[in-house]
């Protein structure tokens, strides 16, 4: 794969993870009641990060925010703080990663600016996913800690109760933006690695270019270096050569079409 | 304004079917559930089941399971409740009612009163 | 199933008097997700459809008189009608409208004394 593609590539697939955080971040079925093994009931309850929500079998939905800061867990601000500083993570990683793609021409940028704002972008894909990844395995394991505890108040609880009046309680499952926020972390972390794998290709290599002349026992002897590279430290010539090799197109070549990675 | 308006009395033999129809107006007939109630001559009301005209899913008490079927037309805006296996003490006004907030019935028909008598 | 219990099953009150109707259900009928109790009233009078009154234990249907009050919240529930008039003499039912099947309490029949 080209520089360019898998640049572009890392870009599509950052921006597709970003856009699922934020659409996790924002959906309200985080937990939705479970309806295995309970009583049936009409009413349809379920939970995000920023309201409750009670969807009636008449088809009548009212959502209630958490308007309150301090009555609120720990655990659900610190979840909400990890999907918020992913997004922002994100938004910026996205911001650098436009500048750095090396189908756009922005002035004199030359490609040791553009590698370096490359890696700069997938490492904040990378922290942004690790973040949304986070959040969503924390909420899960606190879901499965209340409903563990709920199931225990369910059987341990009826006894004392005349058998005659029983309070029914709602248990919570995993709702669909858990999974939502699982993949599009995922997504965001690989995006992030693509991107600093296009760094590599990226990265300018003089000696892979110039021709250095040596002057030894009066004869002019022109040789390329091959295994040698220790400035940047990416291995073999061979295998630079093969990540810059786009066929019979130059690099430049790519640059006058720009439309066919113009990912913007 | 919301109507339903249910098909007229009906005599029945002991073993047979009924069929109740329930045509509503005045509303988008596929986004609310009709729920169908029976009351038996002096005595309390019992619901039976409903459907969701927009999907077709129904909910039945388990009590009439196996010999009520709830359906419903959206072309012609009609729910249907069909009890089979007709029994003496199936002698009812079958009332549908159109669902409102908090799962309640607030939209009635104005009852159809179904004899099962040999 | 859910039980409903009414009481008194009937009950006769005076013109302009205060009639109060009690009704109990097996389970609670709140649902912590909006901390609303789905108990429903309504009013039956002789071969008509029952009336919606109140629904949510508490909120009065439109265009229902303000003498008509619902309150109580799990198990409990009142229907009070704070001043009797001559059109309010019916069967009146409390109805679970939480958990199917829904159910209805066996109603309380309104008299004037």
């Known amino acids: 794969m080209s520089v360019t593609a898998c640049q572009g590539l890392g870009f599509v697939v950052s921006l597709i993870g970003f856009a699922g955080i934020i659409a996790a971040t924002c959906m309200d079925q985080w937990s939705t009641q479970d309806l295995y093994n309970n009583p049936v009931t009409a009413v349809f309850n379920y939970q995000g990060l920023w309201r409750s929500c009670v969807r009636e079998s008449s088809g009548f939905t009212e959502c209630r925010g958490y308007f309150t800061l301090l009555g609120l867990p720990a655990m659900l601000q610190a979840v909400r703080a990890l999907m918020i500083v992913g997004i922002v993570l994100g938004v910026i990683g996205i911001l650098v990663s436009i500048f750095a793609l090396k189908c756009i021409r922005i002035g004199s940028m030359d490609d040791s600016a553009k590698a370096k704002m490359t890696l700069t972008s997938g490492i904040l894909f990378i922290i942004s996913g690790i973040c949304a990844i986070i959040g969503v395995s924390v909420f899960a394991n606190m879901l499965v800690t209340n409903f563990w505890m709920s199931t225990a108040n369910m059987y341990s609880g009826m006894g004392g109760m005349g058998g005659m009046v029983q309070t029914v309680q709602t248990r919570y499952t995993f709702g669909a933006a858990l999974f939502v926020g699982w993949v599009a972390g995922g997504l965001t972390l690989i995006g992030g690695v693509m991107m600093c794998i296009a760094c590599r290709g990226l990265t300018p290599d003089d000696s892979n270019f110039k021709a250095v002349s040596y002057h030894a026992s009066g004869q002019n002897v022109a040789y390329r270096p091959g295994g040698f590279k220790a400035s940047t430290g990416f291995g073999s010539n061979t295998r630079n050569k093969k990540i810059y090799d786009g066929g019979a197109r130059t690099e430049d070549d790519e640059q006058s079409h720009p439309t066919k990675y113009d990912y913007v | 304004q919301v109507q339903l308006v249910q098909s007229g009395a009906e005599v029945k033999k002991p073993g047979s079917s009924v069929k109740v129809s329930c045509k509503a107006s005045?509303?988008?007939?596929?986004?609310?559930?009709i729920e169908w109630v029976r009351q038996a001559p002096g005595q309390g009301l019992e619901w039976m089941g409903l459907?969701?005209?927009?999907?077709?899913?129904?909910n039945y008490n388990e009590k009439f399971k196996g010999r009520v079927t709830i359906t419903a037309d959206e072309s012609t805006s009609t729910a249907y409740m069909e009890l089979s296996s007709l029994r003496s003490e199936d002698t009812a006004v079958y009332y549908c009612?159109?669902?409102?907030?908090?799962?309640?019935?607030?939209?009635w028909g104005q009852g159809t009163l179904v004899t099962v008598s040999s | 199933d859910i039980v409903m219990t009414q009481s008194p099953d009937s009950l006769a009150v005076s013109l302009g008097e205060r009639a109060t109707i009690n009704c109990k259900s097996s389970?609670?009928?709140?649902?912590?997700?909006?901390?609303?109790?789905?108990l429903a009233w309504y009013q039956q009078k002789p071969g008509q459809p029952p009336k919606l009154l109140i629904y949510w234990a508490s909120t009065r249907e439109s265009g229902v008189p303000d003498r008509f009050s619902g309150s109580g919240s799990g198990t409990d529930f009142t229907l009070t009608i704070s001043s009797l008039q001559a059109e309010d003499v019916a069967v009146y039912y409390c109805q679970n409208d939480y958990f199917y099947p829904f159910t209805f309490g066996q109603g309380t029949k309104l008299e004037i004394k």
């Open positions: 389970q609670s009928l709140l649902n912590t997700g909006n901390n609303k109790n789905y």
């Open positions: 459907i969701n005209p927009g999907s077709g899913g129904t």
């Open positions: 009612a159109r669902v409102y907030y908090g799962n309640t019935f607030a939209y």
């Open positions: 005045g509303y988008a007939f596929s986004n609310y559930l």
